[in-house]
């Protein structure tokens, strides 16, 4: 049977004067030699060697300082061994309790706590909760922390209180006003032993958040300005406003609005976000002949809603604005400012020279009729394609359009027309758009098998080749160009297969050079920018079908009409 006792030891103290702090004995000791052994944390597990046992009498001594925060109690396994090293008792677990000493101050979880609270908040509103811990024995006075506010900056009336036990910081008043004081700095102490023991301090930085509790107020009681008729203005007037709320926030940012007089939407007010000024813009031109003076009223509010503490006091304050309209000689303008012309279908892009598009005249603003004493010139005129009559404003082509023209956008070319008032020298500008015939990019070329044919057998094979096989959209129709003269048909075209045909003379032909104009159409009936002119030489041949002598050039004969079709 074990006989045992253990005294508690106090941390951070020399407990050796109380040794042995524990004693174990076995009643087997009466009749045999017993050796005592101990093990466990503080003995053969770190921290090593704190407790030692006298193997002969079972006295357990403490050898060094212990720390309750490291080891609140030591569980010592005790064994009683006989001479053979066998246990004579079941191992005993002996507990040595370590008594707490107030050796740890409270520790705040942060050195500076940051909090914020809206101005005008009700008293007792929660601002923040401070957190501190104490490593001494839990649920003991040594670890019981009491909080208190040591100081407040700016000093004066106390604005906050702290819960002694929970560390909750709350408002003491409902009169926090950011416009007066925008932040507070508190020093708070936490002391253990419920306020009388070891203490630590922390800082609290409390930001007072802005609410929209100040109305924007226009600095002037009325405004006036002058503007010439028929002009727009991006900044006719600036309205200044005073708002005490936090700058550059929605609580400060002014929103200007019309309360009356702008039903025609001539004016707009934009807020300059840097200065908070209202910029009055004229966005629709005013006509002196219709109105010589304009009166309207404006008011201002904030981008943010007003705070519930002041919203009931808000009244729309209308401020009058007077605008004088100044009469000016109005001059000329193009109405409409642009005009579109279309080139008739069937007119080829290489036959545009001299083609008249129409006229585009300026209007006299005072009379509303076509302007007189005006000289017309073209401004921008890409490629020099067009010309305008300086008096009549008639516009026509002076150049054909090249397939590779870079200034054709969406099958349209554009140019600028300037009307110069010869009385004042003032210029008005209009734009013309010309829709031009489309080029068929997929037109094939017609190739002759040979250039020379004999009078004895005047025929030659034609074949069609596309430039881009991937864009081939056949079948194509090839025909002789129709002639205005009612002449007998001289040539005929006969299909041979899907890609070739035979061009034959229908009557006796004399030696010479012949131009045969051919028209190619695709399956969408799109005209190509041809006719393509096929040049043939007809000559007297030898028995090997070779020309005997060079043929003098002669005017081309182009008669009749025939057609053939390639493809399926």
């Amino acid at each position: 049977e074990w006989v045992k006792f253990a005294k508690p030891c106090r941390e951070r103290e020399d407990n050796s004067r109380r040794n042995p702090i524990a004693k174990i004995t076995s009643d087997f000791q009466k009749n045999q030699k017993i050796t005592y052994r101990i093990s466990g944390v503080g003995i053969d597990q770190p921290p090593f060697g704190i407790f030692v046992v006298d193997p002969n009498n079972g006295d357990i001594n403490i050898t060094a300082i212990v720390d309750r925060e490291e080891t609140p109690s030591f569980l010592i396994t005790c064994r009683a061994l006989n001479a053979l090293g066998q246990d004579v008792e079941r191992p005993l677990i002996l507990t040595v309790k370590i008594l707490d000493v107030n050796d740890n101050p409270p520790i705040f979880s942060q050195t500076i706590f940051k909090g914020e609270i809206e101005e005008n908040s009700a008293s007792n509103s929660l601002v923040m909760i401070l957190n501190a811990t104490d490593a001494d024995e839990p649920n003991h006075m040594n670890s019981k922390i009491a909080f208190k506010i040591v100081s407040q900056e700016p000093a004066g009336m106390s604005m906050f209180l702290i819960s002694r036990n929970t560390g909750e910081v709350r408002t003491l008043t409902s009169s926090l006003d950011r416009e007066q004081i925008s932040s507070y700095h508190l020093v708070v102490s936490g002391a253990d032993n419920d306020g009388t023991g070891l203490s630590t301090q922390c800082e609290c930085s409390i930001k007072i958040k802005d609410v929209n509790d100040n109305f924007p107020v226009l600095r002037e009681s009325q405004y006036s300005a002058r503007i010439e008729e028929n002009t727009l203005n991006a900044e006719l007037l600036r309205f200044q406003v005073t708002d005490w709320d936090e700058e550059y926030t929605d609580n400060w940012l002014a929103v200007y609005f019309f309360t009356s007089g702008n039903e025609g939407n001539w004016f707009e007010i934009e807020t300059d976000p840097r200065t908070n000024e209202g910029i009055l813009k004229v966005v629709k031109a005013l006509d002196y002949e219709q109105v010589q003076s304009m009166q309207f009223s404006i008011a201002v509010r904030n981008k943010a809603e007003f705070h519930q503490s002041v919203i009931s006091q808000y009244r729309v304050q209308s401020t009058p604005v007077t605008i004088q309209v100044i009469d000016v000689r109005e001059g000329i303008s193009f109405r409409p400012p642009s005009k579109t012309f279309t080139v008739q279908r069937g007119v080829s892009t290489n036959k545009l020279v001299g083609y008249i598009l129409g006229t585009y005249q300026a209007t006299d603003e005072d009379t509303g009729k076509a302007a007189s004493s005006v000289r017309y010139v073209l401004g921008r005129n890409d490629g020099g394609l067009l010309v305008i009559d300086s008096k009549t404003a008639q516009i026509k082509f002076v150049k054909n359009i090249d397939r590779d023209s870079t200034f054709i956008v969406n099958k349209t070319i554009s140019a600028e027309v300037l009307a110069i008032d010869e009385n004042t020298g003032k210029t008005s500008t209009g734009t013309i758009y010309v829709e031009v015939p489309s080029f068929n990019e997929n037109c094939p070329s017609v190739v002759l098998e040979k250039k020379d044919i004999c009078t004895s057998s005047p025929s030659v094979t034609l074949s069609v080749r596309t430039l881009d096989r991937g864009k081939y959209t056949g079948p194509y129709t090839v025909s002789l160009e129709e002639q205005p003269l009612k002449l007998p048909v001289m040539w005929t075209i006969t299909t041979l297969n899907a890609t070739s045909a035979l061009l034959q003379a229908q009557q006796q032909v004399s030696p010479g050079v012949y131009n045969v104009p051919v028209i190619v159409k695709d399956n969408q009936d799109g005209l190509c920018d041809t006719p393509e002119s096929l040049t043939l030489t007809v000559c007297q041949c030898d028995d090997r079908s070779m020309c005997r002598a060079p043929i003098p050039s002669r005017e081309p004969n182009t008669y009749g009409e025939s057609s053939w079709r390639l493809g399926p």
């Epitope: 050796s16 921290p47 060697g49 300082i65 490291e70």
Partner: antibody, heavy 127, light 110 residues
Framework: QVQLQESGPGPVKPSGTLSLTCGVS?????????WTWVRQPPGKGLEWIGE???????FLNPSLKSRVTISVDKSNNQFSLKLTSVTAADTAVYYC????????????????????WGRGTLVSVSS | ELVLTQPPSVSGTPGQRVTISCSGS????????VYWYQQLPGTAPKILIY???QRPAGVPDRFSASKSGTSASLAISGLRSEDEADYYC??????????FGGGTKLTVLQ
């Protein structure tokens, strides 16, 4: 369980400063231990450099004291070693260790030992 | 200079008993506890003996130690090949701080 890990910039030039950090993971550096630096030149024995307690108290090897600074960073749970004016003789594997250092009561000796070690990091001093 | 003196090397065959000595002065071994560390090749040291003659939990009882006056010794009985390592004694010196012995290389001969 608690682990220690040494880290540093690698080779140091003669007359330069050797800087090492020991990260403590799985436990708090504010526990009641002495956080220690020990070094071992290649093929030689162990040499105690010094130790620090979490409150900043230190014990330093008198022969190195003028060149050694040991500091503790509680917020990052680590402690550091700085050794200035180094020479080739400072080339060694540097270990950080957790030490127990308790003054014995009357009639009892002082406890001083290391129960937990880092893996060690080799620092070479050469130009 | 070293304050704790150890033999640079000792050797023995498997099963044999070997001892490693550590001698010093009254300022460390004489008045403070001696600790022994084992350092296996390529690893950090590990505590083998605390408070002169006590074994930490997990250390085999083949390892024993003693202290007498200003000297201490470590004995390893029933030598095994895995005992091949460097062994260091250490103690706190009231004037110099922590001191280690120069270390002893134990070779297990096959």
């Amino acid at each position: 369980q608690v682990q220690l890990q040494e880290s540093g910039p690698g080779p140091v030039k003669p007359s330069g400063t050797l800087s090492l950090t020991c990260g403590v993971s799985g436990g708090s550096i504010s526990s009641n231990h002495w956080w220690t630096w020990v070094r071992q030149p290649p093929g030689k024995g162990l040499e105690w450099i010094g130790e620090i307690y979490h409150n900043g108290s230190t014990f330093l090897n008198p022969s190195l004291k003028s060149r050694v600074t040991i500091s503790v960073d509680k917020s990052n749970n680590q402690f550091s070693l700085k050794l200035t004016s180094v020479t080739a003789a400072d080339t060694a594997v540097y270990y950080c260790a957790r030490g127990w250092h308790r003054t014995g009561f009357r009639g009892y000796p002082s406890h001083w030992y290391f129960d937990l070690w880092g893996r060690g990091t080799l620092v070479s001093v050469s130009s | 200079e070293l304050v704790l003196t150890q033999p640079p090397s000792v050797s023995g065959t498997p099963g044999q008993r070997v001892t490693i000595s550590c001698s010093g002065s009254s300022s460390h071994i004489g008045s403070n506890y001696v600790y022994w560390y084992q350092q296996l090749p390529g690893t950090a040291p590990k505590i083998l003996i605390y408070s002169n003659d006590q074994r930490p939990a997990g250390v085999p009882d083949r390892f024993s130690a003693s202290k007498s006056g200003t000297s201490a010794s470590l004995a390893i009985s029933g030598l095994r090949s895995e005992d091949e390592a460097d062994y260091y004694c250490a103690a706190w010196d009231d004037g110099q701080g922590g001191v280690f012995g120069g270390g002893t290389k134990l070779t297990v001969l096959q």
